[in-house]
Interface confidence: low
Amino acid sequence: SAPGEDEECGRVRDFVAKLANNTHQHVFDDLRASVSLSWVGDSTGVILVLTTFHVPLVIMTFGQSKLYRSEDYGKNFKDITDLINNTFIRTEFGMAIGPENSGKVVLTAEVSGGSRGGRIFRSSDFAKNFVQTDLPFHPLTQMMYSPQNSDYLLALSTENGLWVSKNFGGKWEEIHKAVCLAKWGSDNTIFFTTYANGSCKADLGALELWRTSDLGKSFKTIGVKIYSFGLGGRFLFASVMADKDTTRRIHVSTDQGDTWSMAQLPSVGQEQFYSILAANDDMVFMHVDEPGDTGFGTIFTSDDRGIVYSKSLDRHLYTTTGGETDFTNVTSLRGVYITSVLSEDNSIQTMITFDQGGRWTHLRKPENSECDATAKNKNECSLHIHASYSISQKLNVPMAPLSEPNAVGIVIAHGSVGDAISVMVPDVYISDDGGYSWTKMLEGPHYYTILDSGGIIVAIEHSSRPINVIKFSTDEGQCWQTYTFTRDPIYFTGLASEPGARSMNISIWGFTESFLTSQWVSYTIDFKDILERNCEEKDYTIWLAHSTDPEDYEDGCILGYKEQFLRLRKSSVCQNGRDYVVTKQPSICLCSLEDFLCDFGYYRPENDSKCVEQPELKGHDLEFCLYGREEHLTTNGYRKIPGDKCQGGVNPVREVKDLKKKCTSNFLSPEKQNSKSN
């Protein structure tokens, strides 16, 4: 039987009355062409909604916008457009919301063509009040908050100036000209690239990378011949042009650019690219594009220094620079990532890793599904997940995969079951164990969201017709109940719930259309009365993550430790609550060779866990640059996988080789380094 139609499905009693009492409609007194919504702070209940309307005229764009504010999670909204003097707000800059619970908001206004600079509206009290500030420049980008201090803002101007404010946008100072890209680092450090001659485009590959640690009082050039740079975890990456040709290589620094090492990754040519897929303080996933217009490349995973890389996955789908990749971090279970590969026959297949890129496999076929037309063998096939690439190809996929750190083990995604991704209409699948096993959850495409840390899943059918029904499940998608939230169907445009999946409120956005009027409307449904009581100890059960063989003493060991979680029982209908903290009990595992990666100059032969010396490097000086100096590299061929916590067990000690190497990179040779003061 289809999910939700089992006789065993535990129904929530009287849910219609309970939800009806907690359904709040808000009709917006306008229909501007677009609506954008932002949550201000965490657990504050404050939402800002900006509606905008563009009228392109021959000489200029005339626009109108309205600003609304809710402080009860979207149940009621107040028009606060007068707080911003009825000014037109530029949607391309969005609403710049400050980090954490700073309560800060910056709105960038549209100004007339002849003005000296732009205009912003600033709030530091969760949008209760706004201050208008005229800027001495026209912003090119949204204001960027320092992650450490929300009073510090930076912005690029249309003239390529780098502007900084130390008092939350009240006063601005241009700290550098000819800037291409700027980013906040840690400790209020700013990294930026500059051009010397023509422009950012003309100087690509000849840019300089600069750093200021004191908001523009003094500067240090930390890189030359730069093509681009990026930050990930504790790593600073720069792609640097080679001396001899038009290729470039990745260099990495873990000390904010004071010292650099050449990453042991292939160099790339003009038409290729590097991309940091994911990074944390332990390691980085790096995609290196293949030569030619292939649409794929190779994923490499780094060691703890960001220097030595292991090949993780071949033929990784990534269309073009800044293009589409399906690479997804499954945040509900440690070590799990999902992505797509382009197979030899040009079909697209989904792969999953449970050990941070160590091994990749196909997704197990859901037990309640049959293989589709893409499958050669009707009994053997896999689940393939639709993500960014499918969405970009305009397949009938309304949402990317969803997982939340506090909804342990839950992954929801559109997919198809066969030998490859199908262009047919997808269904929605759910995993409750971080991607090891899957079940069909809903027929056809849906919008979905997780509430109350997984206690409730809400879904709305993706349809071109007006809708008035929402589906919800209190047992991780096994059984579904439907609730008609309005008599008059609406054209649905989106589901909105507070980021973090702790809320019990969901807002359904859409518009009504009749012969005379059309209006934006939102329905906010509070599920608090569905989950009547707070969860107690008896509502939780112990679950061992990554468990595949309970008989095995090392069952559940991933990256050197296993974790037992307290998980809400599917049969329990209760509130985890806003204060819910994931309870987990880690235990350390014994080391095996799987807990080590092969150090530079070593590799693992197929189906062997030992690291052996690379034949082509035997007796060679290694082209390996560490901190820009020639030095000896001592290694026993193994290096602990970043983040691996194993102890005891196998200790792969062998004769320590002294690998002499020369440093061929003159990147940032000492004479190129200079310090300047403003």
């Epitope: 504050t44 400050g98 619970n101 700073s102 309560g103 800060k104 450490q148 806003r578 204060d579």
Partner: antibody, heavy 129, light 107 residues
Framework: QVQLVQSGAEVKKPGASVKVSCKAS????????MSWVRQAPGQGLEWMGI????????SYAQKFQGRVTMTRDTSTSTVYMELSSLRSEDTAVYYC??????????????????????WGQGTTVTVSS | EIVMTQSPATLSVSPGERATLSCRAS??????LAWYQQKPGQAPRLLIY???TRATGIPARFSGSGSGTEFTLTISSLQSEDFAVYYC?????????FGGGTKVEIK
């Protein structure tokens, strides 16, 4: 090591104001909130309020609202607590305490409380005519 | 505001014995509760946070339990240095509030 060093003892007349400082060292100043707690002679602990060194947002106990002002100077990693319109019952030892979670000015606390893990040595304020 | 009530006000215990201190909240504070120890002339010292987690450097004889409105601090075998005043403090909703304290004295 992590330390909070407070300013010295003060003797004030009723109606006056007092400003106590608390200098933090050994950790990133902006990474933790700071609470102020006082203790009258022979009495228990009383929480006065909290300041977020990032941005300077504050939340005060209702009892002190309008009389207390908490500020910070990130350049010197120092927080200040000023209490005005002093009365004899304000005679107490005033402590600053590092508060790893803290509340935003907007309301409810964070989801997991780590406790005030580092305390200053205390500043004795005596209010007497 | 949430009112924290500690009992007993004074507890007389012999060295080596077990001491059990109670703290009750006027409404649920989940596990957002801390325990502190204060000796005469000294600043308070954090013992327990999150209702049951020992702070760094606190001996294993100190343990905390409870959730919601009822909390307990247990000192399994009192040492001479443990005679002091103990306070509980909630951080579920502002303003933070302390209990009135329990004085543990030598019997």
């Amino acid at each position: 090591q992590v330390q909070l060093v407070q300013s010295g003892a003060e003797v004030k007349k009723p109606g006056a104001s007092v400003k106590v400082s608390c200098k933090a060292s050994g950790y990133t100043f902006t990474s933790r909130y700071m609470s102020w707690v006082r203790q009258a002679p022979g009495q228990g602990l009383e929480w006065m309020g909290i300041i977020n060194p990032v941005g300077g947002s504050t939340s005060y106990a209702q009892k002190f609202q309008g009389r207390v002002t908490m500020t910070r100077d990130t350049s010197t990693s120092t927080v200040y607590m000023e209490l005005s319109s002093l009365r004899s019952e304000d005679t107490a030892v005033y402590y600053c305490a590092r508060d790893p979670s803290g509340i935003a000015a907007a309301g409810p606390a964070s989801r997991y409380y780590y406790g005030m893990d580092v305390w200053g040595q205390g500043t004795t304020v005596t209010v007497s005519s | 505001e949430i009112v924290m009530t500690q009992s007993p006000a004074t507890l007389s215990v012999s060295p080596g014995e077990r001491a059990t201190l109670s703290c009750r909240a006027s409404q649920s504070v989940s596990s957002n509760l801390a325990w502190y120890q204060q000796k005469p002339g000294q600043a308070p010292r954090l013992l327990i946070y999150g209702a049951s987690t020992r702070a760094t450097g606190i001996p294993a004889r100190f343990s905390g339990s409870g959730s919601g409105t009822e909390f307990t601090l247990t000192i399994s075998s009192l040492q001479s240095e443990d005679f002091a005043v103990y306070y509980c403090q909630q951080a579920r909703l502002g303003p933070w509030t302390f209990g009135g304290g329990t004085k543990v004295e030598i019997k």
